[in-house]
């Protein structure tokens, strides 16, 4: 699921991976526009073995994940696309 | 040329534990990610575990999460499956494959020649 | 979990012949899916990867076709090396073989 949050929390991630991950391990892509308390953009991914990790989301492989999952207008991806608003 | 040579396999009792050992050669060994795959005795494939390019990730089938272990050592170039609690059902030939980065897709595109796990009293 | 169903199960078929395998998976898979062939034996082979694109060394008659749930491998012209076990792969969630589809001479 990649999924955009508007949050009022300050930043999540204290270290970031630029180390990639195979779409097929991933979860869940939650991505935190900057802004309201945190001066950055940050990406965290959940994986299939349960763990988290915060990713840099200047990392060239995010950002071509992330295109190919904004390209694909399936709704039954195994990654799909929603947002989630500003309440 | 890629070459993956498995080794460890054997008979062993119920309970018991084996360990392979995969060596690889031809190829930059730490760029890749790497997996275990098993075939029961003329059955189909199934994955069994997968592991980053460090080691520091690692993935199982859920049917041996918990009694298998994939760990990796790069300066030897080695591949490893550690199998403790083995079940009759844990009988297979297991191979040790390369997984290929394609758009972000990781594909086994090289196999070893497989060793064979046999799990009996 | 995605299963992946894989027919038929065993196909008889002369030198000559086309031949269609089908693999069908559980959910949407987009292009993420790869065939292997493989002899007694020995260890799997890949052919085809990302659905259409043919493995470096894999002779023009094996193709690669699908997108989604539903793909198919077709080999135009059957010829004597090509009776063996095929497999498809999906790799979009974790790993799913298909059964597999048993090769066999007419």
């Known amino acids: 699921v990649l999924e955009v949050y508007y949050t009022s929390l300050r930043c999540r991630c204290v270290q970031e991976s630029s180390v990639f991950i195979p779409r097929r391990f991933i979860d869940r892509i939650q991505i935190l526009p900057r802004g309201n308390g945190c001066p950055r953009k940050e990406i965290i991914v959940w994986k299939k073995n349960k763990s988290i990790v915060c990713v840099d989301p200047q990392a060239e492989w995010i950002q071509r994940m992330m295109e190919v999952l904004r390209k694909r207008s399936s709704s039954t991806l195994p990654v799909p696309v929603f947002k989630r608003k500003i309440p | 040329e890629v070459q993956l040579v498995e080794s460890g396999g054997g008979l062993v009792q119920p309970g018991g534990s084996l360990r392979l050992s995969c060596a690889a050669s031809?190829?930059?060994?730490?760029?890749?990610?790497m997996a275990w795959v098993r075939q029961a005795p003329g059955k189909g494939l199934e994955w069994v575990a997968s592991?980053?390019?460090?080691?520091?990730?690692?993935y199982y089938r859920d049917s041996v999460k918990g009694r298998f272990t994939i760990s990796r050592d790069n300066a030897k170039n080695s591949l490893y499956l550690q199998m403790n609690s083995l079940r009759a059902e844990d009988t297979a030939v297991y191979y040790c494959?390369?997984?290929?980065?394609?758009?972000?897709?990781?594909?086994?595109?090289?196999w070893g020649q497989g060793t064979l796990v046999t799990v009996s009293s | 979990d995605i299963q992946m169903t894989q027919s038929p199960s065993s196909l008889s078929a002369s030198v000559g012949d086309r031949v269609t395998i089908t693999c069908k998976a559980s959910?949407?898979?987009?292009?993420?899916l790869t065939w292997y062939q493989q002899k007694p034996g020995k260890a799997p082979k890949r052919l085809i990867y990302?659905?259409?694109i043919l493995q470096t060394g894999i002779p023009s008659r094996f193709s690669g076709s699908g997108s989604g749930t539903e793909f198919t491998l077709t080999i135009s012209s059957l010829q004597p090396e090509d009776f063996a076990t095929y497999f498809c792969?999906?790799?979009?969630?974790?790993?799913?073989f298909g059964q597999g589809t048993k090769l066999e001479i007419k």
């Open positions: 792969l999906q790799q979009s969630s974790l790993y799913t």
């Open positions: 031809g190829f930059t060994f730490s760029d890749y990610y």
């Open positions: 592991i980053n390019y460090d080691g520091g990730d690692t």
């Open positions: 990302n659905t259409n």
């Open positions: 494959a390369r997984e290929e980065d394609y758009d972000g897709s990781y594909v086994m595109d090289a």
């Open positions: 959910q949407n898979i987009n292009k993420e």
